[in-house]
């Protein structure tokens, strides 16, 4: 007879503690760091994942790339404040009372300020551009095969509705995946493009968030697709508000 404890895991989030003590002995999983209950039938929100990650700190990885209107996650890891639904709170502050506003994917979209800083609303990131460079291969990948494989990946592994994968561009060795999802398009139960992009980013880095699944093995017509660098650009429904000093730096 299999122990309940053995069957009680969260397939979509290994950074959880699970026990079969929910209603009627349901397996109930809580995110590390926040202790919030998570729905293991779908992706966990990026905010809760970041919080869990900070509760068991590893080497911080950061991306630094200037851009015009697109935001890049230059600040790297931080311990975020999440709302009761697991979304990022619009205003984030650190232990030294330095505060800033973030978008729906938790990326800073204003200059840093003090506790008086106001962030009126959580601005939605409606367009994400994932920029990949793959390792050299014998020849270029067939564009339509690559397109189909990446769309399948986002549909099957991340459960993102196909309509939110707007395009896949390819100019060897650069691959660009465009995700688009306006507030009005996102229905209840839809995976958020920000969460899907974060799971993909962690997969690409060999840090899969899925429980017990092997790492990401991306193949196009049997040929391994090995990514050597990733950049993710975030475009918000309302442009970010940075001082001119930062924009001209």
């Amino acid at each position: 007879h299999t122990a309940a404890q053995d069957n009680c895991t969260c397939p979509t989030n290994k950074m959880t503690v699970c026990s079969p003590d929910g209603p009627g002995g349901r397996c109930q999983c809580r995110a590390l760091g926040s202790g919030m209950a998570v729905d293991c039938s779908t992706l966990t929100s990026k905010c809760l994942l970041l919080k869990a990650r900070m509760s068991a700190p590893k080497n911080a990885r950061t991306l630094v790339r200037p851009s015009e209107h697109a935001l890049v996650d230059n600040d790297g890891l931080y311990d975020p404040d999440c709302d009761p639904e697991g979304r990022f709170k619009a205003r984030q502050c650190n232990q030294t009372s330095v505060c800033w506003c973030v978008n729906s994917v938790g990326v800073r979209r204003t200059d840093k300020g003090d506790l008086s800083l106001r962030c009126d609303e959580l601005v939605r990131t409606h367009h994400i551009l994932i920029d990949l460079r793959h390792r050299p291969t014998a020849g270029a990948f067939n564009h339509s095969d690559l397109d189909a494989e990446l769309r399948r990946l986002f549909r099957e592994r991340y459960r993102l509705h196909p309509k939110f994968v707007a395009a896949v561009h390819y100019e060897q060795p650069t691959i660009q995946i465009e995700l688009r999802q306006n507030t009005s398009q996102k229905a209840a139960g839809d995976v958020d493009i920000g969460d899907a992009a974060y799971y993909f980013e962690r997969d690409i880095k060999g840090e899969s968030l899925f429980q017990g699944r092997g790492g990401l093995d991306l193949r196009v017509r049997g040929e391994p697709l090995q990514v050597e660098r990733t950049l993710i650009y975030y475009l918000d429904e309302i442009p970010p508000k940075f001082s001119m000093k930062r924009l001209t730096a």
Partner: antibody, heavy 116, light 107 residues
Framework: QVQLVQSGAEVKKPGSSVKVSCKAS????????INWVRQAPGQGLEWMGQ????????HYNQKFQGRATLTADKSTNTAYMELSSLRSEDTAVYYC?????????WGQGTLVTVSS | DIQMTQSPSSLSASVGDRVTITCKAS??????LSWYQQKPGKAPKSLIY???RLVDGVPSRFSGSGSGQDYTLTISSLQPEDFATYYC?????????FGGGTKVEIK
């Protein structure tokens, strides 16, 4: 195989307390929740509460909050349900049931009669 | 609390009949629904859990279906040993709540 053996029938006076036991065997006691359900004569099933011996966490039906106490003794693999301030409406068969994801194994039931 | 409305409260049927019992929740319960069979003087017995999963050892003539607020237990061909009372249970949230029961009697 999974077995839940409950204590025998009880006759109690109004205002007194009753403690029903449920001895589990055939599985690891701390891995599953135990729920308590009662059934008044000729009536349907009514959920009273749930205890998880693994962490001693519990949930009660608000109706029994303050009157019912669920406990678990890990050394003897036994769950207990104590109901105080008994009244005639508490006359019922009391069941313990091991649950996992809604799938239940039930004890044989304990008849508690409250009568003056 | 989530209310579970079970219907009918009783029904008469013959051996070989197809029998359908329904349970309606006062709100969506995400398929967290079980069905139990109880015979007089006996403890309930699990038939179905998670709305449509058959418990090991339960005959395949029993099946569960539904989603959201509406769920159904079907007995495809009623057998003599199936005459009993059937209960649904929601375990989407605390407190767990049972339907009022359906008594299946011989016509």
């Amino acid at each position: 195989q999974v077995q839940l053996v409950q204590s025998g029938a009880e006759v109690k006076k109004p205002g007194s307390s009753v403690k029903v036991s449920c001895k589990a065997s055939g599985y690891r006691f701390t891995d599953y929740v135990i729920n308590w359900v009662r059934q008044a004569p000729g009536q349907g099933l009514e959920w009273m509460g749930q205890i998880y011996p693994g962490s001693d966490s519990f949930h009660y039906n608000q109706k029994f909050q303050g009157r019912a106490t669920l406990t678990a003794d890990k050394s003897t693999n036994t769950a207990y349900m104590e109901l105080s301030s008994l009244r005639s409406e508490d006359t019922a068969v009391y069941y313990c049931a091991r649950f996992f994801e809604g799938l239940a194994y039930w004890g044989q039931g304990t008849l508690v009669t409250v009568s003056s | 609390d989530i209310q579970m409305t079970q219907s009918p409260s009783s029904l008469s049927a013959s051996v070989g009949d197809r029998v359908t019992i329904t349970c309606k929740a006062s709100q969506g319960i995400n398929n967290y629904l079980s069905w139990y069979q109880q015979k007089p003087g006996k403890a309930p017995k699990s038939l179905i859990y998670r709305a449509n999963r058959l418990v090991d050892g339960v005959p395949s003539r029993f099946s569960g279906s539904g989603s959201g607020q509406d769920y159904t237990l079907t007995i495809s061909s009623l057998q003599p040993e199936d005459f009993a009372t059937y209960y649904c249970l929601q375990y989407d949230e605390f407190p767990l709540t049972f339907g009022g029961g359906t008594k299946v009697e011989i016509k």
